[in-house]
Interface confidence: low
Amino acid sequence: IPVIEPSVPELVVKPGATVTLRCVGNGSVEWDGPPSPHWTLYSDGSSSILSTNNATFQNTGTYRCTEPGDPLGGSAAIHLYVKDPARPWNVLAQEVVVFEDQDALLPCLLTDPVLEAGVSLVRVRGRPLMRHTNYSFSPWHGFTIHRAKFIQSQDYQCSALMGGRKVMSISIRLKVQKVIPGPPALTLVPAELVRIRGEAAQIVCSASSVDVNFDVFLQHNNTKLAIPQQSDFHNNRYQKVLTLNLDQVDFQHAGNYSCVASNVQGKHSTSMFFRVVESAYLNLSSEQNLIQEVTVGEGLNLKVMVEAYPGLQGFNWTYLGPFSDHQPEPKLANATTKDTYRHTFTLSLPRLKPSEAGRYSFLARNPGGWRALTFELTLRYPPEVSVIWTFINGSGTLLCAASGYPQPNVTWLQCSGHTDRCDEAQVLQVWDDPYPEVLSQEPFHKVTVQSLLTVETLEHNQTYECRAHNSVGSGSWAFIPISAGAHTHPPDEFLFTP
């Protein structure tokens, strides 16, 4: 670290005095201090001498000596006061520029440390400081306004009390610049606009920034529009608003509108689309298939997307049958608005019961008329099976009826022994019935099929099983011939003697 001679932190001299400051280091050294006249610099290897034989108040300041080759970057400093009774202040700069919330140093240096007790900061022409001005003073550096605000951009003077009267410095102009975080904030409303030809419309493009220096314009399909601008200042922000009013829109007015604002930080833009239509419209659609199949007991949400202008005057869900005259509960119907002209309507059908299969229609109305979208809901059921023994045309026949949805497939099994269900090891014969007879097949109902197995002689120590299956599940019925007739075994149920 370099060393300064005289080895004192502060030196007080009178005007006209000779001052010699010597700095010694291990390598070459350099002086740094306030720009002032009359100094002579003499360097000799590892030492440097700064001298004047006619010190003035302008030589007041802190002189720092550094050693450029020192990796630690050490330095030494001495503060020189040139105590001029006529000049209490040495002002190093007459204009100070800072950003808002930074500390602003007004560099008026006191030429006599004794005067420190009577210093103050004022605005020019003796005006007091603005309220909430928080400042401090250092005789070496001057006045510091802490966390300067834009409103504190003023002309200031430093005041010292000398012999009972206040002596002012020359003025220092403080410029506090707003911190511009980025391009202006933008809003363009509405985000989307639809109007019928001949209706009125309004599009508002507004931009705001902490700084007044920004531009904003509205453009239509890349053409800049000449719209008068309204300016305002509130909430510490400058606002510029462009309002486009159209009393009777036509198709030429349609298209893309962009609100663009720019400042030194860059450009922001936001867009909206304006659609002009010939007449009111109402479109219903669904991302779902209009024909729905759901397993009984499960839930289903039916969703309809509505695109409309003007807005809906009415809408509702209706059950069109065929099972009952019940109507969907309003609490199960839900509406959400995606944006101004698009809405989603949902009907929740939890734990579907057999009587809830059928047609569900969503109806909506606006000035363009009524529209409806109808869903067909069919319930899926696992097969239910029953077997009976009968004679058809004199032949003994096992008759299997299976009911379910989708239409069940039927398989007959013959196995040894008496059992509720044939397992692989017991199976003697298997017959697939590829075309069972359809007994009933009405919309929204189960499909009932019938399969016949002609048996010349019933083997008494055997079981005949009818199995039915579809995509939902399977069902079976075991028929056990006994000497007194025949026993049937519905799965996991009691024996039944017809």
Partner: antibody, heavy 118, light 110 residues
Framework: QVQLQESGPGLVKPSETLSLTCTVS????????WSWIRQPPGKGLEWIGY???????NYNPSLKSRVTISVDTSKNQFSLKLSSVTAADTAVYYC????????????WGQGTLVTVSS | QSVLTQPPSASGTPGQRVTISCSGS????????VYWYQQLPGTAPKLLIS???QRPSGVPDRFSGSKSGTSASLAISGLRSEDEADYYC???????????FGGGTKLTVL
């Protein structure tokens, strides 16, 4: 349906001021640019200038020193004054509604012939 | 002398296709929309084409507009006797800060 109707003297003496008024009916004067356009006999169209309903104006540079366009929103009217006229200012004068693309004149008056002659 | 240049006359027979050109510069046609106006004899001009190629409602689709660089053109297909009129192109001029018109083209249907 918006309609525009020009009115004013059909004969003006040289060096005097030509004054015309355009009355807008069937629609508001607000939100549009209102222009004056003229057509000398047997010649093409020449744009004179426009006024926005707020009062801001823009004039053809070649006529700027002699033109004043004003607006009276309460009467739904706008007016043209052309000073120091000469025979070269003899023309059919049209008023027109311009949308804010400025060149988009969707409604025109039927035009009024102004002759400059002593 | 008009800022936009149009041929003074054009002609065609009924059913024909006729094109009218309009030439300008980078400060008008080059950077702004072109508009076309039709002026039937003894009447006020009527907007025919807006924004280079948009037809206002009521204008037949026989009329079409296009723009390329600093030039624009109006095409009329299936020419009819009622199309006989003067046609003017117009554009905003950035350097003059005003509307400029072409000198007009007189269309004759032979």
């Amino acid at each position: 349906q918006v309609q525009l109707q020009e009115s004013g003297p059909g004969l003006v003496k040289p060096s005097e001021t030509l004054s015309l008024t355009c009355t807008v009916s069937g629609g508001s004067i607000s939100s549009y640019y209102w222009s004056w356009i003229r057509q000398p006999p047997g010649k093409g169209l020449e744009w004179i200038g426009y006024i926005y309903y707020t009062g801001s104006t823009n004039y053809n540079p070649s006529l700027k020193s002699r033109v004043t366009i004003s607006v009276d929103t309460s009467k739904n009217q706008f007016s043209l004054k052309l000073s120091s006229v000469t025979a070269a200012d003899t023309a059919v004068y049209y008023c027109a509604r311009g949308w804010w693309e400025l060149t988009f004149f969707d409604y025109w008056g039927q035009g009024t012939l102004v002759t400059v002659s002593s | 002398q008009s800022v936009l240049t149009q041929p003074p006359s054009a002609s065609g027979t009924p059913g024909q296709r006729v094109t009218i050109s309009c030439s300008g510069s980078s400060s008008n046609i080059g950077s702004n929309y072109v508009y076309w106006y039709q002026q039937l004899p003894g009447t006020a001009p009527k907007l025919l084409i807006s924004s280079n190629n948009q037809r206002p409602s009521g204008v037949p689709d026989r009329f079409s507009g296009s723009k390329s660089g600093t030039s624009a053109s109006l095409a009329i297909s299936g020419l009819r006797s009622e199309d006989e009129a003067d046609y003017y192109c117009a554009a905003w001029d950035d350097s003059l800060s005003g509307v400029v018109f072409g000198g007009g083209t007189k269309l004759t249907v032979l």
